[in-house]
Interface confidence: medium
């Protein structure tokens, strides 16, 4: 029986040109996490494999950074980044858990308000 639950960053907004952190956490299960996939609609953004580490899809490598933790940082946001993002936890023996985040990227009202930052 799957007992786990995923908590996520939730529905979020960001400004064009800024950065945003997407984070999920799987709790209430003792299942072993073998891999976490990050997807935007039907596109694979990144994979974090327990044995092999991170793989960022080539088409996103300039704008996606791994972390914090199993999360993902999106940089240089564009309005086209608006949409649903999914953290997909592959676990043993439970199976797959999926968390959903909706991101809305807004036109910058004041240029310096775009939140730019780095993940150390």
């Amino acid at each position: 029986m799957m007992t786990g639950t995923i908590e996520t960053t939730g529905n979020i907004s960001a400004e064009k040109g800024g950065s945003i952190i997407l984070q999920c956490h799987l709790s209430s299960t003792t299942a072993q996490v073998t891999q976490v996939n990050w997807e935007q609609q039907d596109q694979l953004l990144a994979i974090c494999n327990a044995d092999l580490g991170w793989h960022i899809s080539p088409s996103f490598k300039d704008r996606v950074a791994p972390g914090p933790g199993l999360g993902l940082t999106l940089q240089s946001l564009t309005v086209n980044d608006t949409g649903e993002y999914f953290c997909i936890y592959h676990t043993y023996p439970d199976g797959t858990y999926t968390g959903r985040i909706f991101l809305e990227v807004l036109e910058s009202s004041v240029a310096e308000h775009g939140a730019r930052f780095q993940i150390p």
């Epitope: 908590e7 960053t9 979020i12 945003i20 952190i21 997407l22 984070q23 956490h25 939140a115 930052f117």
Partner: nanobody
Framework: EVQLVESGGGLVQPGGSLRLSCAAS????????MGWFRQAPGKEREWVAS???????WYADSVKGRFTISADNSKNTAYLQMNSLKPEDTAVYYC????????WGQGTLVTVSS
């Protein structure tokens, strides 16, 4: 109007402690995520720690074991307890919500110096 107000900074000696607070107001609902960032002079703003509404936390490697982030959802307030402070922790500390989007507050200056 959505506002984030940081407080609690100051001058502290190496090895000392400070507790920063971030009061959030103007939200129609409690943020799902609160985070602390910092910006040292001449450097880019960097993520320090974050907490989900349910209490799960993440920390940058540089502060792990020394800093503790927490949130009081009933008060829409986030905290950063900073122990064993080092000179390299000197920076303006900012809090933000929901993944690092605006609004950024004015920040609170933490200076670690003997």
């Amino acid at each position: 109007e959505v506002q984030l107000v940081e407080s609690g900074g100051g001058l502290v000696q190496p090895g000392g402690s400070l507790r920063l607070s971030c009061a959030a107001s103007g939200f129609t609902f409690s943020p799902s995520w609160m985070g602390w960032f910092r910006q040292a002079p001449g450097k880019e703003r960097e993520w320090v720690a974050s907490v989900l509404r349910g209490g799960y936390t993440w920390y940058a490697d540089s502060v792990k074991g020394r800093f503790t982030i927490s949130a009081d959802n009933s008060k829409n307030t986030a905290y950063l307890q900073m122990n064993s402070l080092k000179p390299e922790d000197t920076a303006v500390y900012y809090c933000t919500r929901d993944g690092g989007f605006d609004p950024w507050g004015q920040g609170t200056l933490v200076t670690v110096s003997s």
